[in-house]
């Protein structure tokens, strides 16, 4: 008897965190033997949808015309072939920003920040939130930090880096969160520039570069004590 | 779990040289960085190095400027300390241990004892 | 450098007592304050980093507080297996540096 089917891919286009009132189309990658695809929406009747494949059957669209919070949450799919269904896919993770208003961003204590030394980002929401989420623009990850106070209502999240390098430098924006709905987010503040002085850009170790230099190192993961974010949203709690 | 194992402690003469070895687990090593830091018997904590993932960057603290060398191997998930033209007063417990991105160091490894004598 | 100055050097405490260390240093390191135990023959280990925030597994008897060059370390509830030595350390700008310690025991 064969093994279970593999199971299909499953992404978003033009990203998985979507703007309310945009379009996004959800893909569903499986195999030429597909004959139907289905896609559930967690927490939601199932199937969400089904399509037939499109052509070479290996694939199906799934649309969302206008982007609500309706379309917010978590999806896999499936696909049936002559031998049953396969296994579900990994999850997609949709978000909607646009959901509060924004918050404001910025860096204490000043947005121009000598390499070596530590810089802390504040964002500040005007009613009450519990989680905040700082991302940077043309970051390899682009969705970096998210954290909950204990599931109390904040006005505000602090995101220290230390020790910061060139590497820190680039365009900053939050984004603020109820704990009830991790998948809808605020609007994004207005970007924070963040300026790192001092650096020196060397691809290689310098074996005799000190602290007295001014030179620092790369910048690190800013999730707070987990690896690298992978694709969609990726939450660390404090 | 996440697990530092440091390794090439000895006894050595002053002037000698060692290389020490600290070898990661349980997390994904190329993600942190990484640093060296010290304790002489009966003392306190001494910072000594710092390298990033990418080993583009460094920093020494300027009692082993010029005589110790920080380097690592992400695909042995493995940090290394090259200490060269040793001094009674580098004797001391070396420890490895992973930065956590905010000023500070989040798991240590158990220390490996280094031990420059005549 | 940045030189930080922890107090007392040693403490002698009684299962049960609130313990309050403080470290000050040697000009504004912002919230940039960790706090380690170390026990004899082992390795530090984080309890508290950035000031007040509670490192993963650690109990919640433990706890800091403090910004710019003053802070302060406490033990809510002294328990027996908190007797080690404890260390503050400053990482708002390297060189990195540590407090000399303060070494906890039981009356």
């Known amino acids: 008897q064969a093994g279970p089917l593999p199971k299909p891919t499953l992404w978003a286009e033009p990203g998985s965190v979507i703007s309310w009132g945009n379009s996004v189309t959800i893909w569903c990658q499986g195999t030429l033997e597909a004959r139907e695809y289905r896609l559930d929406k967690e927490e939601s009747p199932a199937p969400w949808d089904r399509q037939n494949p499109l052509e070479p059957k290996n694939k199906a669209r799934f649309s969302i015309p206008s982007m609500t919070e309706d379309y917010a949450g978590r999806y896999r799919c499936y696909y049936r072939s002559p031998v049953g269904w396969s296994q579900p896919s990994d999850p997609l993770e949709l978000v909607m920003t646009g959901a509060y208003s924004k918050p404001t961003l910025s860096a204490l204590p000043s947005p121009l920040v000598t390499s070596g030394k530590s810089v802390t980002l504040l964002c500040q929401s005007r009613s009450p939130m519990d989680t905040f989420l700082l991302i940077k623009e043309r970051a390899a990850h682009p969705l970096l930090h998210l954290r909950s106070e204990h599931g109390a209502q904040q006005h505000q999240a602090e995101f220290p880096m230390s020790p910061v390098t060139s590497v820190h430098g680039g365009t900053y924006r939050c984004f603020s969160s109820h704990g009830f709905s991790h998948y809808l987010l605020s609007h994004p503040s207005d970007p924070l520039e963040l300026i790192v002085s001092g650096s020196l850009e060397d691809p290689r170790p310098s074996p005799t570069r000190s602290v007295s230099t001014a030179a620092g190192p790369e910048d690190q993961p800013l999730m707070p004590t987990g690896s690298v974010p992978h694709s969609g949203l990726r939450r660390h709690w404090e | 779990e996440v697990q530092l194992v440091e390794s090439g402690g000895g006894l050595v003469k002053p002037g000698g040289s060692l290389r020490l070895s600290c070898a990661a687990s349980g997390f994904t090593f190329s993600d942190y960085g990484m640093h060296w830091v010290r304790q002489a018997p009966g003392k306190g904590l001494e910072w000594v190095s710092y390298?990033?993932?990418?080993?583009?960057?460094?920093y020494y603290a300027d009692t082993v400027k010029g005589r110790f060398t920080i380097s690592r191997d992400n695909a042995k998930n493995s940090l290394y300390l090259q200490m060269n033209s040793l001094r009674a007063e580098d004797t001391a417990v070396y420890y490895c241990?992973?930065?956590?991105?905010?000023?500070?160091?989040?798991?240590w490894g158990q220390g490996t004892l280094v031990t420059v004598s005549s | 450098d940045i030189q930080m100055t922890q107090s007392p050097s040693s403490l002698s405490a009684s299962v049960g007592d609130r313990v309050t260390i403080t470290c000050r240093a040697s000009?504004?390191?912002?919230?940039?304050l960790n706090w380690y135990q170390q026990k004899p023959g082992k390795a530090p280990k984080l309890l508290i980093y950035y000031t007040s925030r509670l490192h993963s597994g650690v109990p919640s008897r433990f706890s800091g507080s403090g910004s710019g060059t003053d802070f302060t370390f406490t033990i809510s509830s002294l328990q027996p297996e908190d007797i080690a030595t404890y260390f503050c350390?400053?990482?708002?700008?390297?060189?990195?540096?540590f407090g000399g310690g303060t070494k906890l025991e039981i009356k």
């Open positions: 241990a992973r930065a956590d991105g905010r000023g500070a160091m989040d798991y």
């Open positions: 390298i990033f993932s990418g080993s583009s960057t460094i």
């Open positions: 350390q400053q990482g708002n700008t390297l060189p990195w540096t």
């Open positions: 000009q504004d390191i912002s919230k940039f």
